[in-house]
Each structure stands twice: as structure tokens, then as C-alpha cells.
């Protein structure tokens, strides 16, 4: 058993049929010694008397808010949550496996630049009695500070018969060094509590591996005289790290016909312009990627050819 | 060339070769063999490798003030990785395919380090750590981890040379 926060405790249980459970001793936070009784949740049934209460925790019916009283007055509370371990593996019932980029991916994170700011998100089908708490650090043995905000519900989607809820959180490394080569990964830890079930989820990554630039901005076409060719130009997104001579991007320019089956023409360039042939009813799209490190491409910025 | 005395390197040549290194490091990575282990091998293999750190002067301001600190750090890393790529980790079982980019990568690391430090001048280099793989699967795991680490290192080096070529070239 360990303390999650004041008066909230997590009991770790090996979860299998007829498992013996864990013996837990609760102590009433009071100077009083006599006349103390214990109850669980809203029930008035007295579970025991005395300053300490010993219970065998085996299932969710044994978890909940234990309260010690004296003469009708509440002295203190202890909320017991359960953390299930099945066949040596902690349960992951609360969050949905996003399966990208690999199985058992519950948290996904992205950064728009090298400033040390990043966003993580996760999915669940649970709509009520759900709380999240997020902590983060750079490295784990001698952790350096990362400050995370509160997790918020950022989207709701209907998936078949189910509703899916997306939560997200923004974090910022306290002393980021954008030009350095990261040697210690960022660690993100999410505590999830649904009713009386506790679970924790972690992700470990380098900012360089979660970089996804915003799409290029100010995408423009300039027709070339007496030619089907156009000059496409664009700019670095405002959110990308500066100076651009140091934090350089590379670009992919694509000409795509109306039909998805039509052949796509693609050009790769380090410049912020390219000359392409503009076909009727086609569109021109440009996306960006770090020039020197193959993290994610940005989403496409597009303009019609006409 | 970056001579320990402090003259400027051939920024444009270094830029071109460092960008080539980035491409090679990424093309070599998936070709060192089928690898599920990399998903689980979470412990840092590469704590002993020279990283370009915050105080190494490889940021735009540090390069403007005195690029020598940074260039020395880059040179140290290039020599280090060149030795690793020539070690038993890459030459032992399982054998790399004859046309593997690792050979080109090895040669290019040497080429860039020589651009930075001509014959007769010596910056101190770092000892390569004893990672002591005894099994082929351990070598395979280390190859992945070393190439991942090299990708990060050459990305910073390439940024340095690109910025130098754009702003510090005579």
C-alpha cells in the first residue's frame, strides 16, 4: 500500500480467482484513543472499533472511503483504491490502446518545435467518475523539471456504438536547450482513477522523436509566362524553431489530381519554392519535416491549381 | 579546416558532408536486421557516447562567439562513432550485407573528422566504452542503439554546419 495523495491510498493486488489479497491496517488520524468506530462509504454498519482497523482487501467491494468516528463526529477519512496486477502485468482498463506507432501505446505526444513544449493525449470510453493527474521530468534517476498543466477533455468522437473521449495535457521543460542533442528522455507519467480503480501509464521519448512541424504557411502559386508551370512558394510555420539557418526544414511538394487514383507528382526540396506543372482540377500541397532528423512530416498545406 | 589554433573550417564542405551523414545514418538504420528487440531495449546504451550538450557552444549564439568549442566536440564525436562502426559490434556476427550503408557511413565519419582536423593536429578523443556484446542478438541491439544515437548526433552537427555556412562563412 502507498499514498497517492493526502488520505488516498493505493492497494496493489495480485488479481486472480481466490487470490489471498492484501492485509491493510488503517490508523485513525486523531489524538483520541477510545470510543472510535469505523464505517465504509455511505454504510452505517460498524466494521470495527479502536484507533486502528485491520482489513483484508481482496476485491473492489473492500475498497472505498473508510471513515473513523467518535460519538457521531467524523475524525478522519482514508480512501482506498485498487491497482490490479494480472499475471505480473498491471491492468490497463481505463485507457484505450492507440496501437500507433506500436501496440500498448496509451499515451501519444507531439511537439511543434524544439522549445521543450509538447502535448500528450490519450483516449478512453469512460465518461464519468474519472480523474487524471500528469507528472513529467527529463530523466528518471536525477530528474530535471518539466511542468505540466491539468489534463482536459479535448475531443469527443462517436466510434460505432461507443463514444470515445480524448484528453490532452500540455507540458513545458523548465530549462530547455533547443540546440543540444538530448541524452536523457522525457518521462511522462499519468495517474488515472476511475471510481475505485487506479492505473498508471507512462511514456518515454526524446523531443526530437515527437517533432511534428505545423504545415508551411502562406502557400502561393505564381504562374510562369507561356508555360503550364507554376512557381509554388511558402514560408516556414510561425511555430517552428528559429533561426531557420540552424533549425532547417525540408519540404515535399505534391501535385494531386481530383481523383485519388491519379498519379501523384512529388518533388522534395530544401528551398521555400518549387516549380511544378499545374494540371487542371489538381491541387498543390506542401508539407514540412526536420531537414536533418526524420521525425514526422507536418500535415499538408494545400491550394487549388486553378 | 578547423585547426586547434582557431581558423575557420570549410563550412560549406562540412555542411554538405554532414547532410550526407544524416542521410546515411537514416538509411543504415533499418538495414542492420529485423529487430523487435529495439522496442523493448529501453535502457540507455549510449550514456557513454559523447553528446553535444548545452554548454558545448553549438547553439547559434555560441557559434558566433567562438565556434572552436563546438567543433572540437563534434570532432570528438565523429572519431568516437567512427571507432564504434569499425568495432566488433558492426564487424561481428551477424554479418552486415556487403552493400550495407554502414561502410559508407564509416568512411564519411572519417572524412568529416579529417575536414575538421588536418593531419598533424590532435584534439583529445574519448575512449570508446566497453559494451561487451557476447551474443549476436546483443550486437544487433547495440547496432540499432548506436545508429539511433548517431542520427541524433549528426543532426546537431549538420545544423551547426548549415548555420555556419549561412552566417559564418567568409
Amino acid at each position: 500500500i502507498w499514498e497517492l495523495k493526502k488520505d488516498v491510498y493505493v492497494v496493489e493486488l495480485d488479481w486472480y480467482p481466490d487470490a489471498p489479497g492484501e492485509m491493510v491496517v488503517l490508523t485513525c488520524d486523531t489524538p483520541e484513543e477510545d470510543g472510535i468506530t469505523w464505517t465504509l462509504d455511505q454504510s452505517s454498519e460498524v466494521l470495527g472499533s479502536g484507533k486502528t482497523l485491520t482489513i483484508q482487501v481482496k476485491e473492489f467491494g473492500d475498497a472505498g472511503q473508510y471513515t473513523c468516528h467518535k460519538g457521531g463526529e467524523v475524525l478522519s477519512h482514508s480512501l482506498l483504491l485498487l491497482h490490479k496486477k494480472e499475471d505480473g502485468i498491471w491492468s490497463t482498463d481505463i485507457l484505450k490502446d492507440q496501437k500507433e506507432p506500436k501496440n500498448k501505446t496509451f499515451l501519444r505526444c507531439e511537439a511543434k518545435n524544439y522549445s521543450g513544449r509538447f502535448t500528450c493525449w490519450w483516449l478512453t470510453t469512460i465518461s464519468t467518475d474519472l480523474t487524471f493527474s500528469v507528472k513529467s521530468s527529463r530523466g528518471s534517476s536525477d530528474p530535471q523539471g518539466v511542468t505540466c498543466g491539468a489534463a482536459t477533455l479535448s475531443a469527443e468522437r462517436v466510434r460505432g456504438d461507443n463514444k470515445e473521449y480524448e484528453y490532452s495535457v500540455e507540458c513545458q521543460e523548465d530549462s530547455a536547450c533547443p540546440a543540444a542533442e538530448e541524452s536523457l528522455p522525457i518521462e511522462v507519467m499519468v495517474d488515472a482513477v476511475h471510481k475505485l480503480k487506479y492505473e498508471n501509464y507512462t511514456s518515454s521519448f526524446f523531443i526530437r522523436d515527437i517533432i511534428k512541424p505545423d504545415p508551411p504557411k502562406n502557400l502561393q502559386l505564381k504562374p510562369l509566362k507561356n508555360s503550364r508551370q507554376v512557381e509554388v512558394s511558402w514560408e516556414y510555420p510561425d511555430t517552428w524553431s528559429t533561426p531557420h539557418s540552424y533549425f532547417s526544414l525540408t519540404f515535399c511538394v505534391q501535385v494531386q489530381g481530383k481523383s485519388k487514383r491519379e498519379k501523384k507528382d512529388r518533388v522534395f526540396t530544401d528551398k521555400t519554392s518549387a516549380t511544378v506543372i499545374c494540371r487542371k482540377n489538381a491541387s498543390i500541397s506542401v508539407r514540412a519535416q526536420d531537414r536533418y532528423y526524420s521525425s514526422s512530416w507536418s500535415e499538408w498545406a494545400s491550394v487549388p491549381c486553378s | 579546416r578547423a585547426v586547434p589554433g582557431g581558423s575557420s573550417p570549410a563550412w560549406t564542405q562540412c555542411q554538405q558532408l554532414s547532410q550526407k551523414l544524416c542521410t546515411l545514418a537514416w538509411s543504415a538504420h533499418p538495414l542492420v536486421g529485423h529487430m523487435d528487440l529495439r522496442e523493448e531495449g529501453d535502457e540507455e546504451t549510449t550514456n557513454d557516447v559523447p553528446h553535444i550538450q548545452c554548454g558545448d557552444g553549438c547553439d547559434p549564439q555560441g557559434l558566433r562567439d567562438n565556434s572552436q568549442f563546438c567543433l572540437q566536440r563534434i570532432h570528438q564525436g565523429l572519431i568516437f562513432y567512427e571507432k564504434l562502426l569499425g568495432s566488433d559490434i558492426f564487424t561481428g556476427e551477424p554479418s552486415l550485407l556487403p552493400d550495407s550503408p554502414v561502410g559508407q557511413l564509416h568512411a564519411s565519419l572519417l572524412g568529416l573528422s579529417q575536414l575538421l582536423q588536418p593531419e598533424g593536429h590532435h584534439w583529445e578523443t574519448q575512449q570508446i566504452p566497453s559494451l561487451s556484446p557476447s551474443q549476436p542478438w546483443q550486437r544487433l541491439l547495440l547496432r540499432f542503439k548506436i545508429l539511433r544515437s548517431l542520427q541524433a548526433f549528426v543532426a546537431v552537427a549538420a545544423r551547426v554546419f548549415a548555420h555556419g555556412a549561412a552566417t559564418l562563412s567568409p
Epitope: - | H34, G41, E43, P94, S95, P136, W137, Q138, L141
Partner: antibody
Framework: EVTLKESGPVLVKPTETLTLTCTVS????????ISWIRQPPGKALEWLGV???????NYNSGIKSRLTISKDNSKSQVVLTMTNMDPVDTATYYC???????????????WGQGTTVTVSS | DIVMTQSPDSLAVSLGERATINCRAS??????????MHWFQQKPGQPPKLLIY???NLESGVPDRFSGSGSRTDFTLTISSLQAEDVAVYYC?????????FGGGTKVEIK
Amino acid sequence: EVTLKESGPVLVKPTETLTLTCTVSGFSLTSYAISWIRQPPGKALEWLGVIWTGGGTNYNSGIKSRLTISKDNSKSQVVLTMTNMDPVDTATYYCVREGDYGSYAGAMDYWGQGTTVTVSS
Amino acid sequence: DIVMTQSPDSLAVSLGERATINCRASESVDYYGISSMHWFQQKPGQPPKLLIYRASNLESGVPDRFSGSGSRTDFTLTISSLQAEDVAVYYCQQANKDPYTFGGGTKVEIK
């Protein structure tokens, strides 16, 4: 289908040399390592040695001086030679494929049926 | 050599009940976060069969009532609900250092 089949003498006299052949099918010896493992009657398993995809070998130091493992990739055969046999070498000898280096980390995913060798005069 | 110690030597479990076998290595069998610890099942007159590789990965075709856990020196094989066909001897094996070594085996029977 992946198969490994051991063949060789059933009975060997003390001090003689044992030669066992493992013939494999369904995969190439240039892609997978082969280990030899033995099991004395009613006892646990003992690893004898391995021949890697490139032809290099590692042997159990306890019997290294008596062992040689070689292979012929084109014939899909691996040969175990063990000199100076003794009654304590009586065992079932298995030839075993080591799983893909990048996934299995030394686990042996396919085993031959084994050949029982008795050492007796 | 790395010595692998299995416990218990034998285990009698009722059908449908849980069986747990432990394996302790005399030194760590992890290499940069990868546990080179594998579990085999051997039925009488048959060669061993791979069940679990790298401590916790279920080999293809093996029923999911088998699971493995652990790292460094302490490992566990669990059969969540014993079936009649699970009666066998179970071995752990390390492939972190030469020579590869096996545990002494645990015989699982039905109570």
C-alpha cells in the same frame, strides 16, 4: 515447414568419437544459428555449442576441447563431432534452431526430435 | 557460468487452478533492458517446446493461459488455469552469456 532431423550412431564405445548430423529444411543455415543440446536420461538440458550464420562457433567451456561443430550451407547440414566419449555422455542429443536474432534474443524456437546415444563397451 | 535455479522441483495443482514456477539466475540475464530468459515445456518422450521468449513474449500458437514475467535475476512462469495437457516438465533458459544454461526443471502434475 521448418524441420530439423538428427542422425548418427545409437551406440558408441568409450574413447570413440561421436559424429552426429543435423539436416534442416524450411529455412537456410545462412539465416539462422544452430545449437546442439543434450539431455541425459531423467536429467536436465545441457547446451553444448552453437554455429552462427556466418560459420563462427561457441562451445560450452566444460567440454570445449572435445567438441567441433561445422556446417555445409548448400547441403543444409550441421555436424557435431565429440571425441573421447564416456558413459556419462549417454544422452538424447538435440539439434535446435535459434530464433531470429532480432526477436528471440537467444531463444530456441525449433527442436529436432532428438537422437538417443548410448556410450557403453 | 550463470546458474539457473528453479523452484519448486515439482508442483501438484488442481485442474483449472493457477500454477506458478519461479526461476532465479545467479547474475542478471538482462542486456540493456532486454531479458534473455526463455521458458520451455517438455512432455515425456518429446523434445522441449518454446513457450515464452524474452521473459514475457508468448510464442506463436501457445495458449494465452501461459504467461511470463520478471527481469534481471527473478522470473516467473504462470499457468492461469491448469489443463490436463499442461502436465509436463518446465525449464527456464538464459542466453545472455555463454554457455547458455537451463534450470533443473519443474515437474507439473495434477492434484
